[in-house]
């Protein structure tokens, strides 16, 4: 509940409560924006970033970004919000705990996102096809 | 009874720094994560810092990240937030508040898992 000592901010999206007025604490999320990076061609690649920040906002996810060009490989780490898109792309797979990399269409570059909501989901970015969220066994385990 | 106590705001020039504290009691507090939560007048909750029960692992807002320093004394069941290089955009009440990990919602319907508040104010 928010005590009755905390002033209720109206129209305010950093209060973020369920019906009964508890309070929604935020993820936890690494947060290096864009870096340079070695992941390619692997299953599975760790982040390698070394900051974790409390989103601003509680209903922030953790989001991840891998793109690749002819000059280099960018990995993108973040908070957002899933109710807005994010490089003109919806957060289709934001409840997911862990972050599984999928395919966007980007002209002149290979553009892979994911985001997920459990804490620190996004040091961890899953390329592999066997964590494909089509498995419906698999979305049995993430949901239940 | 449960309860969190904070202390230590008050009025500071900018570039200034302040220690919050928060004395816990009535829990066992080694069991709890714990977060040092603001609210400027008028805007919402801003959630500022966090320490994990075990470990002492700290995490931080990008707004505060590199001047304040979240810390805790388990023996003295005390939660500390020391403030450096404050600016105006700092002014604020400081809550202290508590989460059991795992779980991403503050106990219902109490309110006990909040502090008072303690009053911080950057202003020259």
């Known amino acids: 509940t928010i005590p009755p000592h905390v002033q209720k901010s109206v129209n305010n999206d950093m209060i973020v409560t369920d019906n009964n007025g508890a309070v929604k604490f935020p993820q936890l999320c690494k947060f290096c924006d864009v870096r340079f990076s070695t992941c390619d061609n692997q299953k599975s690649c760790m982040s390698n970033c070394s900051i974790t920040s409390i989103c601003e906002k509680p209903q922030e996810v953790c989001v991840a970004v891998w793109r690749k060009n002819d000059e280099n490989i960018t990995l993108e780490t973040v908070c957002h919000d899933p109710k807005l898109p994010y490089h003109d792309f919806i957060l289709e797979d934001a409840a997911s705990p862990k972050c599984i990399m999928k395919e966007k269409k980007k002209p002149g570059e290979t553009f892979f996102m994911c985001s997920c909501s459990s804490d620190e989901c996004n040091d961890n970015i899953i390329f592999s096809e066997e964590y494909n969220t089509s498995n419906p066994d698999l979305l049995l385990v993430i949901f239940q | 009874e449960v309860q969190l106590l904070e202390s230590g705001g008050g009025l500071v020039q900018p570039g200034g720094s302040l220690r919050l504290s928060c004395t816990a009691s009535?829990?066992?507090?080694?069991?709890?994560r714990m977060w040092w939560v603001r609210q400027a007048p008028g805007k919402g909750l801003e959630w500022v810092s966090l320490i994990e029960p075990i470990g002492n692992r700290t995490y931080y807002a990008n707004s505060v990240r590199g001047r304040f320093t979240i810390s805790r004394d388990n023996s003295k069941n005390t939660l500390y937030l020391q403030m450096n290089s404050l600016r105006a955009e700092d002014t604020a009440v400081y809550y202290c508040a508590k989460q059991i990990p795992g779980h991403m919602w503050t106990a219902n319907p109490r309110s006990d898992y909040w502090g008072q508040g303690t009053q911080v104010t950057v202003s020259s």
């Open positions: 009535g829990f066992t507090f080694t069991e709890y």
